[in-house]
Amino acid sequence: SWMWNQFFLLEEYTGSDYQYVGKLHSDQDRGDGSLKYILSGDGAGDLFIINENTGDIQATKRLDREEKPVYILRAQAINRRTGRPVEPESEFIIKIHDINDNEPIFTKEVYTATVPEMSDVGTFVVQVTATDADDPTYGNSAKVVYSILQGQPYFSVESETGIIKTALLNMDRENREQYQVVIQAKDMGGQMGGLSGTTTVNITLTDVNDNPPRFPQSTYQFKTPESSPPGTPIGRIKASDADVGENAEIEYSITDGEGLDMFDVITDQETQEGIITVKKLLDFEKKKVYTLKVEASNPYVEPRFLYLGPFKDSATVRIVVEDVDEPPVFSKLAYILQIREDAQINTTIGSVTAQDPDAARNPVKYSVDRHTDMDRIFNIDSGNGSIFTSKLLDRETLLWHNITVIATEINNPKQSSRVPLYIKVLDVNDNAPEFAEFYETFVCEKAKADQLIQTLHAVDKDDPYSGHQFSFSLAPEAASGSNFTIQDNKDNTAGILTRKNGYNRHEMSTYLLPVVISDNDYPVQSSTGTVTVRVCACDHHGNMQSCHAEALIHPTGLSTGA
């Protein structure tokens, strides 16, 4: 049988002689040269040669493990005399053992990493990895150890994992943002003679909110005219924050001062400035100077840095209100006056007052805007603002008069103001009630006494406070011997009733009834209206069939019914 162990060969042998691999040997070999050893298979006769007498195998060339890690060869032992094999042809392996001829190579030539500033010592930053093409199963040729060549004392690297961590407390981005760390990977477990490779790690400290906003000055002063409408920007203030991005965002607010209700502050998101704006109308004559306490604060605060102090700052803002020549100001936004419709010309209705709000208190003159009183019904005393009538009024023509009064500074006619006057004309009982319509009705020849032939309604242009109360009666001249009677219903209506049984249209075809309508107001007003009653022939239902020669306009509901 064959006697051998597994063969090993060191790659990239640099000696001048052939490299000895091992010996093929059969237990049939007596050492007398009767056996011949033959080598075939991978690289036989080329890479590997055999001494056919001794079975010694040598490598003729410099081998590289990475070309082929294993060579499989075949061995034969033949009896020289008979030419027959004394052993079965067998295969054996020559394993190429790796030498440390490959340095570790990092997966990246340059790594980029970030870590938050002020991180605790030992915070993970990034992991670097180096690979070694040598055989990891043999020796330490591929065992890589990491170390830091540049970047201490700020960072450290775990020797086995390549994990880079922070090594210094309170690294402040505002102090230094960029670090260049050089990491070495060395094989042979980092021992002497190991091969090494390096990589650069560019580490950037990212911002955290560890700085509060700060006003560059403690006091700001701005001026604004008293005429500035709400929303007008007065001035800008800016606090600075050493942080960046979201951590440098600032919110401004007014926390104190007499101007708390009069002014606002809004944050300009683009410039991070606080814009002071007018909130309410200002009045130089009331208050000339305001002071505000404005606060700048970070909206996003990291609780772990609160020990550094409050993340806000405040400044005093002094606002000087500048005087503006203002037009006169009326004592009211609008005036409502009343006057009876029977008022005589030159009757005073009321008065308006306007004052110059400026310190100068310029005198004022009053006038009526004639575009609002084209008929010149009213006038005003230019000195004292008294309003009086210049024409007679009629409530029934116009109930409300809406006019505009102008107040003008005498010394500066450009400064003027206007105010609306609403003048209500009060009712006086100056109209008599009258029929609501023209009444023309009929009565059947065979009508019975006390039969209702018409209901009367009245209207009155006046508008008494307690409502209309009309009374109806026959005119005195027709009251005696009338063929009809008036029944006052006490509800502002009256009925015409027949006073006898039967009428003869041939005797009397038409009756004219004078009716007096009176109101119940002071002074009492009354009028007389005439109702025309025609005598007609009717059917047994009471429906009109024919009247006297004149045609009768027959309004709805004139049928006498039962």
Epitope: D64, E66, P69, I72, E91
Partner: antibody, heavy 120, light 107 residues
Framework: QVQLLESGGGLVQPGGSLRLSCAAS????????MHWVRQAPGKGLEWVSF????????YYADSVKGRFTISRDNSKNTLYLQMNSLRAEDTAVYYC?????????????WGQGTLVTVSS | DIELTQPPSVSVSPGQTASITCSGD??????VHWYQQKPGQAPVLVIY???NRPSGIPERFSGSNSGNTATLTISGTQAEDEADYYC??????????FGGGTKLTVL
């Protein structure tokens, strides 16, 4: 001329078995190490297994280890691949290839391939 | 263990030079072989031991290997060169590793 011819492919259910053959001609079969390589539909080449010239040494890809067995019969100039416990992911064209020392232990030539489909 | 990475596709105009790369950590220390595979056919060895051409392979095929990249170059590319190309090397012990393959399109 040097030729390799695979056979034995076909449709088989998951969990089933199949035996592939590769008949060699035109060279001294017993002097060469042989390999099986497969190619799933539309995918790249994947090495499967190796056998030395006399069959003393075999080696397998992790994906088939314990399920496939490579063998050879030098007297019949034939290479075999016994495939057991087949899975859907074993569906591929299977090629046999000769390892040629003269070409730096590259694969030359290759057989035309045989298709194995594992499906229920 | 070495891992070989190839671009999925490369395009070239006829007559131009096509370069197909195969990258792996320290690949220069490994011998690389290249195979051509046309649709429906078995692979064919076109370059062995980094830069050697088997008999019958046109001279326009050449190879190189340095650093972390091995390259197959086809100069004066012809329409018939349109195929999939694979790089291959020996891995640990007796295992073999292939690249993912590159589809060469001749426009």
């Amino acid at each position: 001329q040097v030729q390799l011819l695979e056979s034995g492919g076909g449709l088989v259910q998951p969990g089933g078995s199949l035996r592939l053959s590769c008949a060699a001609s035109g060279f001294t079969f017993s002097s060469y190490a042989m390999h099986w390589v497969r190619q799933a539909p539309g995918k790249g080449l994947e090495w499967v297994s190796f056998i030395s010239s006399l069959g003393s040494y075999t080696y397998y890809a992790d994906s088939v280890k314990g399920r496939f067995t490579i063998s050879r019969d030098n007297s019949k100039n034939t290479l075999y691949l016994q495939m057991n416990s087949l899975r859907a992911e074993d569906t591929a064209v299977y090629y046999c290839a000769r390892e040629t020392a003269g070409y730096g232990y590259a694969f030359d030539p290759w057989g035309q391939g045989t298709l194995v489909t594992v499906s229920s | 263990d070495i891992e070989l990475t190839q671009p999925p596709s490369v395009s070239v105009s006829p007559g131009q030079t096509a370069s197909i790369t195969c990258s792996g950590d320290n690949i220069r220390k490994y011998v690389v072989h290249w195979y051509q595979q046309k649709p429906g056919q078995a692979p064919v060895l076109v370059i062995y031991r980094d830069n050697n051409r088997p008999s019958g392979i046109p001279e326009r095929f050449s190879g190189s290997n340095s650093g972390n990249t091995a390259t197959l170059t086809i100069s004066g590319t012809q329409a018939e060169d349109e195929a999939d190309y694979y790089c291959q090397s020996w891995d640990s012990f007796l295992a073999v590793v292939f690249g993912g393959g590159t589809k060469l399109t001749v426009l």
